[in-house]
Interface confidence: low
């Protein structure tokens, strides 16, 4: 909290400009009019203020807008956004996608912070729905955000957004989410050649149906066991021993280590013992 002191003669700020970087904290508090700051927020980011000075500017805005900042100010917060707490952000009503993009840009390259999570929450509440443009924006900045959405919300994700998704971004998706994402990924990657296609589609295969797994088994893909273990049990069960052998390639011997776990356990129980014996792994149906 900065003490209330009178502004020294001749120091009253007429506009937000570089001269303010030489002001002490108490001078900023005393000499910068909050309304002036609010109307010239777009200039703040071009000025190399210290974090301490930014604290003073935030304090001035908080006093001017105790119920929460208007969107005209929020859109131009820039690096001042990093000073906001989730509690501050909960007071906002953000409806413009441009505002959302501007603030996400400030946080770009970092893990999603509580501030950003709260901002997105407020934005979606303000809009009343997760439309295609919003999802496009969110998945562009945070591909991992896909897995925080319900299957219903995911249904409006455009296939074009799938290109930004990295394998680790799907770690937290459950099977129902992958059921929705897989057909979109298939559509997104449909023009790729076999080996490149498999590299891209691999992370989404937890949503693949049996017929797609059968098709993959004809393409020498050498699926690893970690991917196989994430496949839908109902999609794996109809596969023959020969198809699983082709699908896994040299990784087939890993089935022995996973024989007590789904979907391997359930698949083994569906096979004829004679067929299992051809693998030479000692699997017992």
């Amino acid at each position: 909290e900065v003490e209330k002191t009178a502004c020294p003669s001749g120091k009253k700020a007429r506009e937000i400009d570089e001269s303010l970087i030489f002001y002490k904290k108490w001078e900023l508090e005393a000499c910068v009019d909050a309304a002036l700051l609010a109307t010239q927020m777009d200039r703040v980011n071009a000025i190399p203020f210290t974090y301490e000075q930014l604290d003073v500017l935030k304090h001035k805005l908080d006093e001017l807008y105790p119920q929460g900042y208007p969107e005209s100010v929020i859109q131009h917060l820039g690096y001042l956004f990093l000073k906001m707490s989730p509690e501050d952000i909960r007071k906002w009503n953000v409806t413009s996608l441009e505002t959302l993009k501007a603030l996400l840009e400030v946080n770009k390259g970092h893990e999603m912070s509580p501030q950003v999570a709260t901002l997105i929450d407020r934005f979606v509440k303000g809009r009343g729905q997760l439309d295609k443009d919003t999802l496009d924006t969110l998945t562009a900045f945070y591909p991992g955000y896909l897995c925080s959405l319900s299957p219903e919300e995911l249904s409006s994700v455009p296939p074009s957004s799938i290109w930004a998704v990295r394998p680790q971004d799907l770690d937290t998706c459950d099977p129902r989410q992958l059921d929705v994402l897989y057909p979109k990924a298939r559509l997104a990657f449909q023009n790729m050649n076999g080996s490149e296609y498999f590299v891209k589609i691999q992370s989404f295969l937890g949503g693949a149906p049996t017929e797609d797994l059968k098709a993959l088994s004809q393409q020498n893909v050498s699926m690893d066991l970690a991917t196989f273990m994430k496949l839908r049990t109902d999609a794996v069960l109809p596969l023959t021993v020969a198809e699983v052998q082709k699908l896994l390639g040299p990784h087939v011997e890993g089935l022995k280590a996973e024989e007590r776990h789904r979907p391997v356990r359930d698949w083994i129980l569906r096979q004829r013992q004679d067929d299992l014996d051809t693998l030479g792994l000692g699997l017992q149906g």
């Epitope: 989730p86 893990e111 999603m112 912070s113 509580p114 950003v116 999570a117 709260t118 997105i120 929450d121 979606v124 509440k125 945070y142 991992g144 955000y145 896909l146 897995c147 925080s148 959405l149 319900s150 971004d169 770690d171 937290t172 998706c173 459950d174 099977p175 129902r176 989410q177």
Partner: nanobody, 126 residues
Framework: QVHLVESGGGSVQAGGSLRLSCAAS????????MGWFRQAPGKEREAVAG????????YYADSVKDRFTISQDNAKNTVFLQMNSLKPEDTAMYYC???????????????????WGQGTQVTVSS
């Protein structure tokens, strides 16, 4: 379906401590974040602390940082909230929550919570 059962609430003097537990049963596949929200009378439900199960990355609300600690017992699908230096403003109904999240910071904000516990009351008197 995931079922969450909380325990450990109660009444305590300001400055005291309590430890909440939340036991989860059912198919936890995909519900990677677990933790605690609270709701005081007449106020919105707010995130208190969350943990990304299996990774031990944590989220804390500013108001409880350095006082509350969230931890987990993966084998038992249980999450704990150790609450120290309790203040009267911590008085609320505390709810265990389970949700999808890509990073633990997303724990803040109740919109994406898929499952809630029934809640356990914490009362801190001055």
């Amino acid at each position: 379906q995931v079922h969450l059962v909380e325990s450990g609430g109660g009444s305590v003097q300001a400055g005291g401590s309590l430890r909440l537990s939340c036991a989860a049963s059912g198919d936890m596949n995909g519900y990677k974040c677990m933790g605690w929200f609270r709701q005081a009378p007449g106020k919105e439900r707010e995130a208190v602390a969350g943990i990304y199960t299996g990774r031990n990355t944590t989220y804390y609300a500013d108001s409880v940082k350095d006082r509350f600690t969230i931890s987990q017992d993966n084998a038992k699908n249980t999450v704990f909230l150790q609450m120290n230096s309790l203040k009267p403003e911590d008085t609320a109904m505390y709810y265990c929550a389970s949700k999808y999240c890509a990073v633990v910071a997303e724990f803040g904000g109740p919109r994406l919570v898929r499952y809630w516990g029934q809640g356990t009351q914490v009362t801190v008197s001055s």
